[in-house]
Amino acid sequence: MRRERGRQGDSSSCERQVDRVNLKPCEQHIMQRIMGEQEQYDSYDIRSTRSSDQQQRCCDELNEMENTQRCMCEALQQIMENQCDRLQDRQMVQQFKRELMNLPQQCNFRAPQRCDLDVSGGRC
C-alpha cells in the first residue's frame, strides 16, 4: 500500500506518554541480558523474575504508548538515559545499546528510524 507519511506525533505528546509508562521492566530485562543473571547486580530485585517475564512486562508497557517511531525512540532514549550511570565501562555501554536496539523487534514493534541513542552528552 502506498502512503505519504503524516506527522509522527509531537514531542510533548510522546514525552507525556514516556513519563506515564513504567520503563523499569525494560531496564531490568536488558540489564539481566548483559549481566547474564550475575548475582552482584542487585540494584533491583531482579533475581526472582526471569528475563522472559521482564521482557513481557516491558513489551506490555511499551504497548501502552502510541505506536509511532517517535514515541518508541523517546522511550529507548529514556531507558538509555536512566541506565547510563550504571554502565561501568565502554564495553557495557555498547552491549546495553545493542540490546536496547533489539528491544522493539523483541516486542514486535518496528525499530525507529533516525533514533540517536547517544543522548547523554558523552556521559555514556
Partner: antibody
Framework: EVQLVESGGGLVQPGGSLRLSCAAS????????MTWVRQAPGKGLEWVAN????????DYLDSVRGRFTISRDNAKNSLYLQMNSLRAEDTAVYYC????????????????WGQGTLVTVSS | QSVLTQPPSVSAAPGQKVTISCSGT????????VSWYQQLPGTAPKLLIF???KRPSGIPDRFSGSKSGSSATLGITGLQTGDEADYFC???????????FGGGTKLTVL
Amino acid sequence: EVQLVESGGGLVQPGGSLRLSCAASGFKFSTFYMTWVRQAPGKGLEWVANIKQDGSEKDYLDSVRGRFTISRDNAKNSLYLQMNSLRAEDTAVYYCTRNGLQDSYSGDFFDHWGQGTLVTVSS
Amino acid sequence: QSVLTQPPSVSAAPGQKVTISCSGTGSNIGHNYVSWYQQLPGTAPKLLIFDNTKRPSGIPDRFSGSKSGSSATLGITGLQTGDEADYFCATWDADLSAVLFGGGTKLTVL
C-alpha cells in the same frame, strides 16, 4: 563512480508546472532513499522531499506539500519531482541527492549530489 | 529563518583551528543524527560528517563532528585556504517530519 544528473529545469510562469528528472548511475539505485534539496540564489540549502527505496513513503517540506510530488522508477534508475502551481519563491537550483538513511537507528545524510538544475519562476 | 542556528560567519588564520556550532531543539538535534556539508563557491555541497561523528572515506581527519544535547559542532583543524566555503548542518525534525538545514556559516581563512 556514483553519478546523479538532473534535467528539466528552466523558466516558467507563476502557476505553471515543471517536471525535474534525475538519472542515477554507479550504484544500486533501488536500495537507497533519494532526496531533492534546493538552494535559492545566494541563500542556504533547503530540503524539499524524501522518497523511500520502494516509493512507499514520502515526506515533503510543508510549503511544497500538495504542489510537488516526488516519485521514482527503480527500473529506469530515475528520480522525479513534479512541480505544480509554481511560485516565485520556488526559484532555486534543485539538487538530486542520494540519502544514506537506513531502516533503523541512522540519520538522513546526503553523500552524493548532482550538479543541480535551475528553476526560475517569473512572469 | 532556519530552526537550526549557525553563526553567519567565522574566521581564522591558516593552520589554526575553528569550530562551527549548530543549535537546535529536542525534536531535531536532541533526538536525531546530525550531518555536515561543505559548499565551495559555485559547486554542489559535499558531505563532511554523518551520524554526528562519522567521516565518509576521503574526508581528512582535520574535520570532526560532535553532538551534545540539542547542539552539534563541526571542528576543523590545520586550516587551509582551500577550506574557505559555506558550511551547513542538517538533521531530521520529528515534529515537522522534515529534514532541516542550518542557515549556513561562511568560513574565511585570513
